[in-house]
C-alpha cells in the first residue's frame, strides 16, 4: 500500500492539444527499495552536481524578464496509457517534461487515483540540463505489484502556481481470483433448503465458480461470478467450499461446514448448591446445544420414597443462568431431580437422575385440640393437646412451646414453658388469681417453632371457688373462650 | 473428532516430580468434567480424582495431598501434578471425560455417573 | 470407603456362550443404579460400554446387557464373539464421597 494524501478535484490539464513524445516503461526497478519499508523522499538529481541525489523541490535558475518572448505551452510528453502484469511482478513507468529554463521552482508529484502519494514511493526524478530547456523524467517502480497497486498513475508539476498534469497510465494487476465473498458456515435445518454464497474478482475477468461438497464437485458447468448455490436439504452435516478460476488460475476458499440442527444433549452437571426445608436450589451445565440455542429448560422432581404415588413434578424455566430454585418442596424429604432443555428441535433426554434432601423445618401447623383446666385442689392448670399430623411436623417434633398469658386488673405478664417431645400435657402453676389466664401451644422441632395455636382462655378465680370445667380450642369462627368459674 | 490425549510420563526417580497433560479436543473443558485413572502393569483401574467444568476438583483419599489436579479452559487442557512419587505410582495414567456428574456443593463432594471418552494413556515410571 | 467386588476374577469361555459376570458393592450404589460397566483390551484404554446399570452406551452391540439395582449388579454377554475377549470392569458412586470405586476386573478369556 502507498502512503496517501486527498485532494480536492482540480480541472484536466492546463494546456489541452496534442503533445509529442513518448514514455519508456521498464520492469526492471531503478531502485530496488523493500516493499514494506515505508516510503521515501523522492530522490533527485540537480542538473549541477548530475551524479549526486537531493531532496526538495528543484531550484531553476531565475530569469530577470519573462516577458521578453512568448513561451510555448508546457505538457507532459503522451506515454503508453496501460500496463497489465502479473501479481508479484516489478514494474517502472515514467512520465516526462521538458521545461524552459527560465521556470524556476518546480515540482512534480506522483499521484494514485486522486491522491497524492507523499514520500513518493520509490520515485526518482532525474534532471537532464540544456540551454534552454530542463527535460525531465520523473520515475515510479514498484518491486512486486500487489493488487492495492491497482489504478490510475499521473503525474503533476507545478510551475508558478499553475499545475501541469500527465495523461494517466492505468496499471492492472493480474493475478489469481480473489474472493470478496466466501461462503459462511451455518447451522440449519434437516431437509430445508438454503443458499451459499461465493463472490470472487479478478483480473484477469471473467471469474468463474465451480461448488464443491465433501471433495465433490457439485456443479458440473461453471457460472460466472457471484454465484449462489441453493442446496436442496441436508441429512448429515457437510463440508462446502467454492473455487474461483480465471486466466491466471485456480483459488479455493475456505472449507465451511454446514451443520444440521439436532435435539441437545442432556446436561453433563447437575449440582445441589443450597437446600432448605422446602426448597433446593440447583445448577447445571448445559450439554451439546445441537447447533440451536438453549430456549428453556424443565427440572423434574419426584419423591424418591419408594412408598410415594411417583408422581412428577416439572418446573420450566428459561435456559439462562443454568439455575433454578425449586420451591413448594415438603420438608425432611428426599428427591429426585432430573433436568432437561430444549432448543427449536426439541427436548434432550432428561439428565440422570440425582438425589436431593430438603432440612428440617419448623412445624406447619400447631397442635390440635388444646384444652385448659384449672386444677384447684393443686392450684394447677392442666394443658393437654393432641400433637401436629406428622406430615406436617416437617422434622422430627423436639417438644412444644407453651406461651401462658395473665392478666388481672392493669397487670399483664407472658411465661414460657418447653415441654418434651413425648408429652401431650402440661401442668403449669398458677400465677395469679382473679386472673384470666390464655394458652397457647406450639410444636417445636430441629427447623425451629411452628405457629402457635388460638389461644384458649381460662378465668383463675380467687381462692376457694369451685373447679368447674375446661376450656378447649374454639371451633373455626367461634369467639375465644372464656370460663368463668 | 471428540479426543483425549495424554502426555508428560517417562522415567522419574523416586521422590521426583512430574506434570502430565491431557489435552482435548472437540469438546470444550468448560462444559465437562474430566478425571485421572490410572492402571498399574497387569493391574485393575483406579480413580484419581475428577475437576469439575468450574474448576472444582475432588481427589480419591489416597490422593490427597501428593496428587493435584488443575486445567487452563484457554488451552482445553487439563494437568495432574504429582509430587513425591513412589516406586506404586508405576502406572500408565489415563485421562477421561465424565459423562455426567453431580456435585454437592454445601458438603463439597461429588459423584461420577460414568467416564464416557478416554485417552489412549501415558506411562510413568518411578524407578531408581 | 466402599468396595466393588467382581466374580469370577478370570472366565473361560467359548464364541456363542452366554456370559455372566457380577459386581457387588459393600454399599449401596448411588441412586441404587449409578453403576457403569467398562470393556478394555490389552494396551488400549477402558471404553464404556452401559450404564445406569443397563442403559447400552453409543454404538455398544446389543449383545451386551446389565441389571441390577442397589448392591447387586450383573453384566450378561448373550452369545460371545471373538471381538469380547478383554477385561470388564464395573465402577460407581456413592453417596456423601467422592470416590468413584472400580471392581477388581473380569477377564474372559478363550476356553
Known amino acids: 500500500a502507498i502512503t496517501e494524501a486527498r485532494e480536492e478535484a482540480k480541472p484536466y490539464p492546463l494546456f489541452p492539444g496534442p503533445f509529442p513524445g513518448s514514455l519508456q516503461t521498464d520492469h526492471t526497478p531503478l531502485l530496488s527499495l523493500p516493499h514494506a519499508s515505508g516510503y521515501q523522499p523522492a530522490l533527485m538529481f540537480s542538473p549541477t552536481q548530475p551524479g549526486r541525489p537531493h531532496t526538495g523541490n528543484v531550484a531553476i535558475p531565475q530569469v530577470t524578464s519573462v516577458e521578453s518572448k512568448p513561451l510555448p505551452p508546457l505538457a507532459f510528453k503522451h506515454t503508453v496509457g496501460h500496463i497489465i502484469l502479473s501479481e508479484h511482478k516489478g514494474v517502472k513507468f515514467n512520465c516526462s517534461i521538458s521545461v524552459p529554463n527560465i521556470y524556476q521552482d518546480t515540482t512534480i508529484s506522483w499521484w494514485k487515483d486522486g491522491k497524492e502519494l507523499l514520500g513518493a514511493h520509490h520515485a526518482i526524478t532525474q534532471f537532464y540540463p540544456d540551454d534552454e530547456v530542463t527535460a525531465i523524467i520523473a520515475s515510479f517502480s514498484i518491486t512486486s505489484v500487489q493488487r492495492s497497486d491497482n489504478g490510475s498513475y499521473i503525474c503533476k508539476m507545478k510551475i508558478n502556481n499553475e499545475e501541469i498534469v500527465s495523461d494517466p497510465i492505468y496499471i492492472e494487476v493480474q493475478g489469481l481470483p480473489h474472493f470478496t465473498k466466501q461462503p459462511e458456515s451455518m447451522n440449519v435445518t434437516r431437509n430445508t433448503a438454503f443458499n451459499l454464497t461465493c463472490q470472487a474478482v479478478g483480473p484477469p475477468e471473467p471469474v468463474n465458480i465451480f461448488w464443491v461438497q465433501n471433495s465433490s464437485r457439485v456443479n458440473e458447468q461453471p457460472e460466472k461470478s457471484p454465484s449462489v448455490l441453493t442446496v436442496p436439504g441436508l441429512t448429515e452435516m457437510a463440508v462446502f467450499s467454492c473455487e474461483a478460476h480465471n486466466d491466471k488460475g485456480l483459488t479455493v476458499s475456505k472449507g465451511v461446514q454446514i451443520n444440521i440442527k439436532a435435539i441437545p444433549s442432556p446436561p453433563t452437571e447437575v449440582s445441589i448448591r443450597n437446600s432448605t426445608a422446602h426448597s433446593i436450589l440447583i445448577s447445571w451445565v448445559p450439554g451439546f446445544d445441537g447447533y440451536s440455542p438453549f430456549r428453556n429448560c424443565s427440572i423434574q422432581v419426584k419423591e424418591a420414597d419408594p412408598l410415594s404415588n411417583g408422581s412428577v413434578m416439572i418446573f420450566n424455566t428459561s435456559a439462562l443462568p443454568h439455575l433454578y430454585q425449586i420451591k413448594q418442596l415438603q420438608a425432611l424429604a428426599n428427591y429426585s431431580i432430573g433436568v432437561s432443555c430444549m432448543n427449536e428441535i426439541g427436548w434432550s433426554a432428561v439428565s440422570p437422575w440425582i438425589l436431593a434432601s430438603t432440612t428440617e423445618g419448623a412445624p406447619s401447623v400447631a397442635p390440635l385440640n388444646v384444652t385448659v383446666f384449672l386444677n384447684e385442689s393443686s392450684d394447677n392448670v392442666d394443658i393437654r393437646w393432641m400433637k401436629p399430623p406428622t406430615k406436617q411436623q416437617d422434622g422430627e417434633l423436639v417438644g412444644y412451646r407453651i406461651s401462658h398469658v395473665w392478666q388481672s386488673a392493669g397487670i399483664s405478664k407472658e411465661l414460657l414453658e418447653e415441654v418434651g417431645q413425648n408429652g401431650s400435657r402440661a401442668r403449669i402453676s398458677v400465677q395469679v388469681h382473679n386472673a384470666t389466664c390464655t394458652v397457647r401451644i406450639a410444636a417445636v422441632t430441629r427447623g425451629g417453632v411452628g405457629p402457635f395455636s388460638d389461644p384458649v382462655k381460662i378465668f383463675i378465680p380467687a381462692h376457694g371457688w369451685v373447679d368447674y370445667a375446661p376450656s378447649s380450642t374454639p371451633a373455626p369462627g367461634n369467639a375465644d373462650p372464656v370460663l368463668i368459674i | 473428532e471428540q479426543q483425549l490425549v495424554e502426555s508428560g510420563g517417562g522415567l522419574i526417580q523416586p521422590g521426583g516430580s512430574l506434570r502430565l497433560s491431557c489435552a482435548v479436543s472437540?469438546?470444550?473443558?468448560?462444559?465437562?468434567?474430566m478425571s485421572w485413572v490410572r492402571q498399574a502393569p497387569g493391574k485393575g483401574l483406579e480413580w484419581i480424582g475428577i475437576?469439575?467444568?468450574?474448576?472444582?476438583?475432588y481427589s480419591a483419599s489416597w490422593a490427597k495431598g501428593r496428587f493435584t489436579i488443575s486445567k487452563d479452559s484457554s488451552k482445553n487442557t487439563m494437568y495432574l501434578q504429582m509430587n513425591s512419587l513412589r516406586a506404586e505410582d508405576t502406572a500408565v495414567y489415563f485421562c477421561?471425560?465424565?459423562?455426567?456428574?453431580?456435585?454437592?456443593?454445601?458438603?463439597?463432594?461429588?459423584?461420577?455417573?460414568?467416564?464416557?471418552?478416554w485417552g489412549q494413556g501415558t506411562l510413568v515410571t518411578v524407578s531408581s | 470407603d466402599a468396595q466393588l467386588t467382581q466374580s469370577p476374577s478370570t472366565l473361560s469361555a467359548s464364541v456363542g456362550d452366554r456370559v455372566t459376570i457380577t459386581c457387588q458393592s459393600s454399599k449401596s450404589i448411588y441412586n441404587n443404579n449409578w453403576l457403569s460397566w467398562y470393556q478394555q483390551k490389552p494396551g488400549k484404554p477402558p471404553k464404556l460400554l452401559i450404564y445406569?446399570?443397563?442403559d447400552l452406551a453409543s454404538g455398544v452391540p446389543s449383545r451386551f446387557s446389565g441389571s441390577g439395582s442397589g448392591t447387586e449388579f450383573t453384566l450378561t454377554i448373550s452369545s460371545l464373539q471373538p471381538d469380547d475377549f478383554a477385561t470388564y470392569y464395573c465402577?460407581?458412586?456413592?453417596?456423601?464421597?467422592?470416590?468413584?470405586?472400580f471392581g477388581g476386573g473380569t477377564k474372559v478369556e478363550i476356553k
Open positions: 475437576i469439575s467444568s468450574s474448576g472444582s476438583t
Open positions: 472437540g469438546f470444550s473443558l468448560s462444559s465437562n468434567a
Open positions: 477421561a471425560r465424565v459423562g455426567f456428574f453431580v456435585g454437592y456443593g454445601a458438603y463439597d463432594y461429588g459423584i461420577i455417573h460414568r467416564l464416557d471418552l
Open positions: 445406569d446399570a443397563s
Open positions: 465402577a460407581g458412586g456413592y453417596s456423601g464421597d467422592s470416590d468413584y470405586a
